[in-house]
């Protein structure tokens, strides 16, 4: 049990103990959510105290202060998903419709996702907010008719399901046009039938 002497400058439990070179001893680290209020000596182990409100320490530590909690920064396109606690910093992510443009251990700056043009949709990603849109063409039988970062390709309308007939086929950028079977075709649509 700490404190105990260590000649080789290593401690038995690296996660929860640390080497104190002045006294050449191993002392306890403070658990998450606390900090060192009194350093250890040969006769007394580390004394820990709970982090004050709006501060935290995430790991077993021998810090003499707690880290200040920080808000997520909307200017940088970030939003909060979990508040700061004594054991964990504020958890942030990119606002919807944005992706992480700068990483420094965590996301520091989000930017607006690029629009995907008509006839395409954004390729689905494993994790939202991880990268900018990669636009892929609508697959056969589907269309998408807007410029948008989030619009999905939709299946073409099946005229027969509605008791209608096809007047114009769908494209990647437009839906099928349907008409009543009784409606006559416009002149440009009526083909000449050779007998």
């Amino acid at each position: 049990v700490p404190p105990y002497g260590s000649e080789n400058q290593t401690c038995r439990d690296q996660e929860k103990e640390y080497y104190e070179p002045r006294h050449r001893i191993c002392c306890s680290r403070c658990p998450p959510g606390t900090y060192v209020s009194a350093k250890c000596s040969r006769s007394r182990d580390t004394v820990c105290a709970t982090c004050a409100e709006n501060s935290y320490n995430e790991h077993w530590n021998y810090l003499t202060i707690c880290q200040l909690c920080r808000p997520c920064d909307p200017v940088m396109g970030l939003e909060e998903i979990a508040p700061c606690t004594s054991k964990r910093k504020t958890q942030c992510r990119c606002q919807p419709g944005m992706f992480c443009a700068a990483w420094a251990l965590e996301c520091t700056h989000c930017e607006l996702l690029s629009d995907c043009p008509p006839g395409t949709e954004a390729e689905l990603k494993d994790e939202v907010g991880k990268g900018n849109n990669h636009c892929v063409p609508c697959k056969a039988g589907h269309f998408q008719n807007t410029s948008s970062p989030s619009a999905r390709c939709q299946p073409h309308t099946r005229c027969e399901d509605q008791g209608l007939v096809e007047a114009a086929p769908g494209t990647a950028q437009s839906d099928t046009t349907c008409r009543n079977p009784s409606e006559s075709l416009p002149p440009e649509m009526s083909g000449t039938m050779l007998m």
Epitope: N54, L68, C69, R70, P71, C72, D73, P74, V75, G77, E79, E80, P83, C84, T90, Q95, P96, G97, M98, C110, L112
Partner: antibody
Framework: EVQLQQYGAELGKPGTSVKLSCKVS????????IHWVIQRPGKGLEWIGR????????ISTEKFKNKATLTADLSSNTAYMQLSQLKSDDTAIYFC?????????????WGQGTLVTVSS | DIQMTQSPSQLSASVGDRVTLSCKAS??????LNWYQQKLGEAPRLLIY???ILQTGIPSRFSGSGSGTDYTLTISSLQPEDAATYFC????????FGSGTKLEMK
């Protein structure tokens, strides 16, 4: 209770600079971002920029990039904004407002504003 | 840049009236919207944040609603002390204020 203290008025000559202060009490500015907002006479509110007091990082709108310099002093819990190369259209009220952990995306607290008058 | 447009720019109403102020964004702001009240010679005061959450200490006659690009501040029964200018402010991809609606008493 969070309170923000700003000086009521500053007079500056064209071409010179003024430095506005915003002293915060009741909250450690190390936990916040301090924002600055301008309101020209009879006009609306316009966001100038913000500073992260722990590291001095600033973000400001393109319009104010070469006009406003934001700084902060953690020891006195005070934020500053220096306005340079003053012109007559810099005449306005300048407000400071923090976004805190409990209000990370809205301005629940405001200074009373400093009226800057630019006149020769 | 996302623009915020408020309408009407001026409004005159009587005590007890139900008043509706509008704020329109030039693109989807995902409900990231606040409302402020400002009286002459004073700093703005936060009324509503995140589209519809009433700030502590604000009377319940104030309410907010909306989504996408269209947002509304409603005063259910106008009181004399509500005469002020009202600003919306988005915090999606940065901060921008609307141009304001000046509300006067008839």
């Amino acid at each position: 209770e969070v309170q923000l203290q700003q000086y009521g008025a500053e007079l500056g000559k064209p071409g010179t600079s003024v430095k506005l202060s915003c002293k915060v009490s009741g909250y450690n500015i190390g936990n916040t971002y301090i924002h600055w907002v301008i309101q020209r006479p009879g006009k609306g509110l316009e966001w100038i920029g913000r500073i992260d007091p722990t590291n001095g990082n600033t973000i400001s709108t393109e319009k104010f990039k070469n006009k406003a310099t934001l700084t902060a002093d953690l020891s006195s819990n005070t934020a500053y904004m220096q306005l340079s190369q003053l012109k007559s259209d810099d005449t306005a009220i300048y407000f400071c407002a923090p976004t805190t952990l409990t209000t990370p995306d809205s301005f629940a607290y405001w200074g009373q504003g400093t009226l800057v008058t630019v006149s020769s | 840049d996302i623009q915020m447009t408020q309408s009407p720019s001026q409004l005159s109403a009587s005590v007890g009236d139900r008043v509706t102020l509008s704020c329109k964004a030039s693109q989807n702001i995902y409900k990231y919207l606040n409302w402020y009240q400002q009286k002459l010679g004073e700093a703005p005061r936060l009324l509503i944040y995140s589209t519809n959450i009433l700030q502590t200490g604000i009377p319940s006659r104030f309410s907010g609603s909306g989504s996408g690009t269209d947002y509304t501040l409603t005063i259910s029964s106008l009181q004399p002390e509500d005469a002020a200018t009202y600003f919306c402010q988005k915090y999606y991809s940065g901060f921008t204020f609307g141009s304001g609606t000046k509300l006067e008493m008839k």
